[in-house]
């Protein structure tokens, strides 16, 4: 018995086609991914072949102004008309509250959604009882297949799932849910979840019973053969795992932000047993026509989007200085108002010892493309934020070595002078620079924000301790020369939209102020451009 | 909270008729398969009848099929089941069940069902 898997991760609000690098469509005929696009391939395959199953492995919510505007909305109803068969909660869901999910959501979808793991206490249990699943049976031809869900435990430090929420260890709360699903006889198993290709070869290894993972979180993107665009295999597709009882569980997950569709054929034998996997992602690239009904869709829900983007979100009462000439050279008003949002972005206080989990952010100046005058009646809306932020990017979450800090410091002003985008902007940091010192041995100071502390307090950087940092997904992946991020960071874990965060920022505080307060020094006797 | 929720159960003489109903609550039900399940007194859990919420294709188990009709009221968010010529052989517990949505269903399967109501007694006396 043949079962086809189609499969999404990581879309991220990315409902509309976009440019190959996953931001603005600019060239529609070099334009990839949509929903318009998606539903043509998937219509396709459904109507070429008998089982087929569209899953969607989480982070659907999260990632452009549809998002913003729509706060899950679009996400249910495009689901909807394309019919997914299944949808694992990723951590993103959980972005604006419970509320958040549980309304534009879990109550509008015709499918179901699931995770294992999340259980619910207090006044929360009854009310969302039912409206997510820890496994769903779904028919498909004669036969029944099981999916089981997950979610990244680290979710309540990534989202805001609120205190009546607990994220089990997967692998833990998995085994019993399998073994249900076997006792009803379903010997055809897919583990659906967010947690990323580590966690999911670990649930394809140590989860009895389970056939294939389905997975999300960490954008992998496996290929067999030669890769169709830009993006590197992290190995190949399906990823073969061998488990502790000596099964051979396929592993799949297709990068992000709906570029690709995950395309995996999987042959059982009559007692549920994988015989044979293959497949590959499919770029959804121009040579597969959008969809005209859901293109139609899509333009009649765009209208809304083009009337907020000058809505006022806030005002500023300072020019927000965002100009090169200052934000490639020192410490700039605009970078500090970044940093300052990307840090309440992140305020979890989920540790009694911790008044926050990070303190700190870093942001390449370059990544900074305008400024923002005060003299237009202190306005700032979306339209002023996506000239400052273009680039579509996320404020990620990482943990680094103090040693990588310091190297990512003394990277920043290792050809200082020269305009270039690295010089970098701060918040929960006080750098001092000595610029006449030689490159790779500028940084002379290097304090940062106490985390395990009830009063904030800046101590000398640690070498050899963990931080937690927040800074552009860019950064995290070794833009600007930041190599030493990419290499050795511990942990990455994929953030908010750039513009969505400062926007919430703005909105919140309703008038802002940002100064040049001292974040970015310079020894004094070296006279600075 | 998801709740299905059964009425119009109770003794009815062989030959007489009765209406179930489900009210469904808590979530959108539009794109679920909606079913009634009985279970007599010491038997397993049988399908009585089944459909889809939009476009309201119906199955019905066999033992039923020409007696029973199960129906939908998309405005009231209530699944009915309507039973003419009840024999003795009807008397038991009735379900109303759900699917949360997914692939189209129509069939009696009941792991496939997601929500299930608490039970409606029917009895049919000769």
């Known amino acids: 018995w043949e079962l086809t898997i189609l499969h999404t991760n990581d879309v991220h609000s990315r409902l509309e086609q976009t440019s190959e690098d996953s931001s603005k469509c600019v060239n529609a005929s070099r334009c990839m991914g949509g929903v318009a696009r998606l539903f043509t391939k998937v219509q396709q395959i459904r109507r070429a072949e008998p089982n087929v199953l569209l899953l969607d492995a989480g982070d659907q919510y999260q990632g452009t102004i549809w998002f913003t505007v729509y706060k899950g909305a679009e996400v249910a109803h495009f689901m909807n008309a394309l019919r997914y068969d299944a949808m694992a909660l990723g951590n993103h869901e959980f972005d604006n509250g419970v509320e958040g999910l549980i309304e534009p959501l879990l109550k509008e979808a015709k499918f179901p959604i699931l995770s294992a793991n999340i259980k619910a206490k207090g006044p929360l249990a009854s009310q969302i009882s039912g409206l997510y699943l820890p496994y769903k049976v779904l028919p498909v031809g004669d036969e029944v297949v099981g999916i089981v869900g997950y979610t990244s435990k680290e979710t309540p430090f990534l989202s805001n799932p609120g205190t009546n929420l607990v994220f089990e260890d997967e692998i833990t709360a998995l085994q019993p849910e399998v073994d249900k699903l076997k006792t009803l006889n379903v010997n055809k198993i897919i583990a659906l979840g967010h947690s990323g290709f580590e966690m999911d070869k670990l649930i394809a290894q140590k989860v009895r019973g389970v056939d294939v993972v389905v997975g999300g979180h960490s954008n992998t993107f496996l290929y067999t053969g030669n890769p169709p665009s830009k993006e590197v295999p992290a190995g190949k597709y399906p990823f073969i795992v061998t488990s502790d009882d000596g099964r051979k569980v396929p592993v799949v997950q297709a990068y992000a932000f709906g570029k690709y569709l995950g395309y995996l054929k999987i042959e059982f034998d009559e007692r549920g047993n994988v015989i044979s996997s293959h497949g590959n992602p499919i770029l959804l690239n121009s040579s597969i026509p959008e969809d005209p009904s859901i293109k139609a869709d899509i333009n009649k829900w765009r209208i809304k989007l083009d009337n907020y983007s000058t809505q006022e979100l806030g005002k500023t009462i300072v020019y927000l200085d965002g100009s090169s000439q200052s934000c490639r050279f020192r410490e700039c008003n605009m970078g500090n108002l970044i940093c300052d949002a990307m840090i309440n972005n992140n305020l979890r206080h989920t540790d009694e010892m911790f008044w926050n989990h990070v303190s700190m952010c870093i942001l390449n100046g370059g990544g900074i493309r305008s400024p923002i005058d005060e003299r237009n009646n202190g306005t700032i809306t979306w339209e002023n934020l996506a000239a400052v932020l273009p680039f579509g990017g996320t404020f990620d979450l990482v943990q680094l070595k103090g040693s990588t800090l310091k190297k990512a410091f003394e990277h920043s002003v290792h050809r200082y002078g020269q305009s270039t985008g690295e010089f970098l902007q701060v918040g929960g940091i006080h750098v001092v620079y000595d610029l006449s010192r030689k490159p790779g041995d500028r940084v002379v100071k290097l304090d940062v924000l106490c985390t395990k502390c009830r009063v904030p307090s800046y101590d000398p950087l640690k070498m050899d301790e963990v931080y937690k940092v927040i800074l552009p997904n860019f950064l995290a992946n070794g833009g600007d020369g930041f190599q030493m991020i990419k290499d050795e960071l511990l942990r990455h874990d994929s953030g908010d939209q750039d513009i969505n965060v400062v926007s919430t920022y703005i909105s919140k505080m309703k008038v802002i102020y940002p100064a040049v307060e001292g974040r970015i020094k310079f020894s004094h006797h070296h006279h600075h451009h | 909270q998801v709740q299905l929720v059964e009425s119009g159960g109770g003794l009815v003489q062989a030959g007489g008729s009765l209406r179930l109903s489900c009210a469904a609550s808590g979530r959108t039900f539009s794109g679920s398969t909606m079913g009634w399940f009985r279970q007599a007194p010491g038997k397993e859990r049988a399908f009585v009848a089944a459909i889809r919420w939009i476009g309201g294709t119906a199955k019905y188990g066999d033992s039923v099929k020409g007696r029973f009709t199960i129906s939908i009221d998309n405005a009231k968010n209530t699944l009915y089941l309507q039973m003419n010529s009840l024999k003795p052989e009807d008397t038991a517990v009735y379900y109303c069940?759900?699917?949360?949505?997914?692939?189209?269903?129509?069939?009696?399967?009941?792991?496939?069902?997601?929500?299930w109501g608490q039970g409606t007694q029917v009895t049919v006396s000769s």
């Open positions: 069940a759900a699917t949360a949505g997914g692939p189209d269903y129509l069939g009696g399967r009941d792991i496939v069902y997601d929500y």
